[in-house]
Each structure stands twice: as structure tokens, then as C-alpha cells.
């Protein structure tokens, strides 16, 4: 029972965490302009791994694609297939894990084969959580570097008579989606693995034992019997969720208001 | 057609508070935000601030903080902009303009004079 | 606040000819976003609410002539008339759209020779 419960646990946490994997990778909120110690502007930019936005006080919003490939820097082209991989993998890892999932009964499937395929699972599910992990922390220390760059010529004079605005980037609402989304990948694939012990079969030899009946010189040899775990014995209706997550991406028309100060 | 239909004149007396309605037709009013411009008597144009038709969100230049408060009504597309403490200073045309591409204002309302005389 | 200085303050032309208006800002209005100068102009007459003319610096508003031209960057932007009409006879005026409190140019004024 508490096999079951962890791997459907497993199943669901890791369903969220790869739901807000694709949620994240899809969002254009990766890096958004730093509004600490800067002119209040009417204008609001942030960007995401597909497309940099702009969105201006009279409430319009124009996004616009990076269409090229070669022009873009090595670490957004690194981060973009990081995110990519983690996906793909999770995706397939869920795939697994629905066949593997003891409250599915699949023809006659061995319980060693389904203790293998929440394995399987399992470890896709860390490596998905990894790779998103590390995409997103990959993007973010290209954030700090940049920031930091930018911070010493933030204001860049013409004869100390012009001052010119240094657009700054901060952490976007994609970073933390992530994150938290790597994290949950990675902690239901934890789950499987955990589960996956639980369901392996394990051999049970009973030594031959001979029985002399009186008179008779017959001995009884039982074979070898394997112990069934629970293979076909829980026949309770069980719920399977569907942990779709729903993230919204951030496409307000507006920009949280602020007095100008 | 875009049109935007401004209360008429007003004569108010130093220290009183007028409201200035700005009536949208011809779009949908939430999808705009408004914005209110100051011309004094012969002078140039003052940006007073910017309010958000939806949210009512807004961002107020800090020289008519406390002298102006802009709120809309979504139910007329009625956007309002309250002058309090009016002193001579505040002897103006006073607009409501749509802020479209850019942040520029691309239909304004026909101007609404306001006189402080005692 | 950002200083928005028109030049000249008036001007005097006769019909036909090309006329240049200059607005210069304390700070840069190009935001890096986009690529785009955050700077409009407007045409007004007296006793009319201004009409825009210019947005992001050069492109023309719908059902504006194409003898209205906007030019420049960063802090120094033109509007230039490339023939000029009698209806064109008004008052001009710049604004930076990109830093609160938007400002507002002094105006340059159109007058006849």
C-alpha cells in the first residue's frame, strides 16, 4: 500500500514539476528590467529564451522572436537545450511511469518489469529535474554577471552633460517557476526510485524437504515458488491524478502601477 | 469613430475642488488606458498622469500629486480626474487623451477650461 | 525630470518651402528593448487639442501627410516639413514617452512670412 502510495505520489509530483518545466521554458519572463535605483520608465522590458518584450504605460505589449540562431549568445543557446532536454526526458519519463504505475494493470505484466520501469522512470525524472536545475541557474548567473557589467557604466556621459538610461536585467518569474519545477522533478523521481525497492520481487527458495512416509521411500521436492507482492491484489478503485499545473504567463497589459517618485 | 467628450467649463472658487469627467466612445474603453494634460493660458502642455481603464492602476506626475486624483468608471467609460485646493496656478485647459503606440496620445478630448476666481 | 528643449521658439516661413524643427532631451529616449526612440510630436492649433503627428520618433501616425518626417536619435530628434502648407500654420510640440513624468517641449511656433 505504501508502494503504491509513493509511486503515485512520485507520478503526480513529477507530473506538476515537468508541467512547470514547459510552463517555464515557455515563458517570457526569464529576465526582467531592474526597476531598483532607476528612472521610473514607461517603458517595461523582459525577455524570455524565444522572444524579448516591451511593454509601454498606455498598456501595449510587442514581443518580438529571436529569429536567428547563430546570433544568439552560447549560453541562451546552452540554456534553451538544457530546458529542451529536461522536457523531452521528463516526457518520456512520464510515459514510463503511467505503464509502471501499480494501479494499472497492463496484461500480465511481471512486477520485476514494472519495478524496472518506475526505475527507469525515476532516474529520467532526476536527470529532467537536473537539467532544468541547471538550465535556469545557468541563466541566472549569465543575469548576475550582466548585471553587475552593466552597474559600473550604468549611466554613460556625453561630457557629463547627457546621461543615457542602462536598461538592467533581473531575475524573471520563469527563473523561480524553474527552479521549483526542477526541484519537484527531481523529488518524484526520488519517490520512483524509493517505490521501485519496494516493488521489486523477491526470490523466496524453499530447501527440499523429504517426507518419509512409512513403508514408502518417496520424496516430495515443492518447487521453488515465487512470492507474489501484491501482483493483482489491490482491487479497490484508486483515483489517478492529473496534476495538470496551469501557469499563467504574465501577458498583463499593464505593468504593477507605482507612484512615480 | 474614437471620440472623446469632456465636462464643460467650469468657474470655481480658490480652495474649492472640481471634477472633470472625460466620456470614451467609439472603442472598447478597458483597452486603453487614459492620460490627463495640463496647458496653461498660452503656455506648453503638462502631463498630470496616466490611468489604467481596467485595473484603475496609476502613476501620477509628482507636481500634481495631491492636487490630482484620476479614477475611472468602467460601467459610462467615464474617466474623472478631481482637482482639490484650486488656487489661480490652476487656471487651465485641462485634457483627457488616449495613449496608443509609444506611449503617444493619439485622441484627445476637445479640452475643459477650468477658472479659479473668487 | 527630463528636460525637453524645442529650437527655434518660433518661425517664420512662406509657403512651399522646407522647414526643420529640432527637440533635444537631457537624457536619451532610446530604449534598448526595442530599438526604438520614444519621442512623438503633435501639431496643434489654437483653441484645438493637439493631433499627433509622430510616434517612436519617426513613424507617421495614420492619416498624417507624408511631408511630416520625424528623424533622430537618442537625444536629438527633427521634424521637418518638407513643403510647407498654410494648414500647417500652428503650434509644434515634442514629448518624451519614455521616462515619468512625461515632459512636454516648449513648442516651436509656425507663422506666416
Known amino acids: 500500500m505504501a508502494v503504491t502510495a509513493c509511486q503515485g505520489l512520485g507520478f503526480v509530483v513529477s507530473l506538476i514539476g515537468i508541467a512547470g518545466i514547459i510552463a517555464a521554458t515557455c515563458m517570457d519572463q526569464w529576465s526582467t528590467q531592474d526597476l531598483y535605483n532607476n528612472p521610473v520608465t514607461a517603458v517595461f522590458n523582459y525577455q524570455g529564451l524565444w522572444r524579448s518584450c516591451v511593454r509601454e504605460s498606455s498598456g501595449f505589449t510587442e514581443c518580438r522572436g529571436y529569429f536567428t540562431l547563430l546570433g544568439l549568445p552560447a549560453m541562451l543557446q546552452a540554456v534553451r537545450a538544457l530546458m529542451i532536454v529536461g522536457i523531452v526526458l521528463g516526457a518520456i519519463g512520464l510515459l514510463v511511469s503511467i505503464f509502471a504505475l501499480k494501479c494499472i494493470r497492463i496484461g500480465s505484466m511481471e512486477d520485476s518489469a514494472k519495478a524496472n520501469m518506475t526505475l527507469t522512470s525515476g532516474i529520467m525524472f532526476i536527470v529532467s529535474g537536473l537539467c532544468a536545475i541547471a538550465g535556469v541557474s545557468v541563466f541566472a548567473n549569465m543575469l548576475v554577471t550582466n548585471f553587475w557589467m552593466s552597474t559600473a557604466n550604468m549611466y554613460t556621459g556625453m561630457g557629463g552633460m547627457v546621461q543615457t538610461v542602462q536598461t538592467r536585467y533581473t531575475f524573471g518569474a520563469a527563473l523561480f517557476v524553474g527552479w521549483v519545477a526542477g526541484g519537484l522533478t527531481l523529488i518524484g523521481g526520488v519517490m520512483m526510485c524509493i517505490a521501485c525497492r519496494g516493488l521489486a520481487p523477491e526470490e523466496t527458495n524453499y530447501k527440499a524437504v523429504s517426507y518419509h512416509a512409512s513403508g514408502h521411500s518417496v520424496a516430495y521436492k515443492p518447487g521453488g515458488f515465487k512470492a507474489s507482492t501484491g501482483f493483482g491484489s489491490n482491487t479497490k478503485n484508486k483515483k489517478i491524478y492529473d496534476g495538470g499545473a496551469r501557469t499563467e504567463d504574465e501577458v498583463q497589459s499593464y505593468p504593477s502601477k507605482h507612484d512615480y517618485v | 469613430e474614437v471620440q472623446l467628450q469632456q465636462s464643460g467649463p467650469e468657474l470655481v472658487k480658490p480652495g474649492a475642488s472640481v471634477k472633470i469627467a472625460c466620456k470614451a466612445s467609439?472603442?472598447?474603453?478597458?483597452?486603453?488606458?487614459m492620460d490627463w494634460v495640463k496647458q496653461s493660458h498660452g503656455k506648453s502642455l503638462e502631463w498630470i498622469g496616466n490611468i489604467n481603464s481596467y485595473y484603475g492602476g496609476t502613476i501620477y506626475n509628482q507636481k500634481f500629486k495631491g492636487k490630482a486624483t484620476l479614477t475611472v468608471d468602467k460601467s459610462s467609460s467615464t474617466a474623472y480626474m478631481v482637482l482639490r485646493s484650486l488656487t489661480s496656478e490652476d487656471n487651465a485647459v485641462y485634457y483627457c487623451?488616449?495613449?496608443?503606440?509609444?506611449?503617444?496620445?493619439?485622441?484627445w478630448g476637445q479640452g475643459t477650461s477650468i477658472t479659479v476666481s473668487s | 525630470d527630463i528636460v525637453v528643449t524645442q529650437s527655434p521658439s518660433s518661425l517664420t516661413v512662406t509657403p512651399g518651402e522646407k522647414v526643420t524643427m529640432s527637440c533635444k532631451s537631457s537624457q536619451s529616449l532610446f530604449n534598448s528593448g526595442n530599438q526604438k526612440n520614444y519621442l512623438s510630436w503633435y501639431q496643434q492649433n489654437p483653441g484645438q487639442p493637439p493631433k499627433l503627428l509622430i510616434y517612436?520618433?519617426?513613424t507617421r501616425q495614420s492619416g498624417v501627410p507624408d511631408r511630416f518626417t520625424g528623424s533622430g536619435s537618442g537625444t536629438d530628434f527633427t521634424l521637418t516639413i518638407s513643403s510647407v502648407q498654410a494648414e500647417d500654420l500652428a503650434g509644434y510640440y515634442c514629448q518624451n514617452d519614455y521616462i515619468f513624468p512625461l515632459t512636454f517641449g516648449a513648442g516651436t511656433k509656425l507663422e506666416l512670412k
Open positions: 487623451a488616449r495613449p496608443h503606440l509609444g506611449n503617444a496620445l493619439d485622441y
Open positions: 467609439g472603442y472598447t474603453f478597458t483597452d486603453y488606458n
Open positions: 517612436w520618433a519617426s
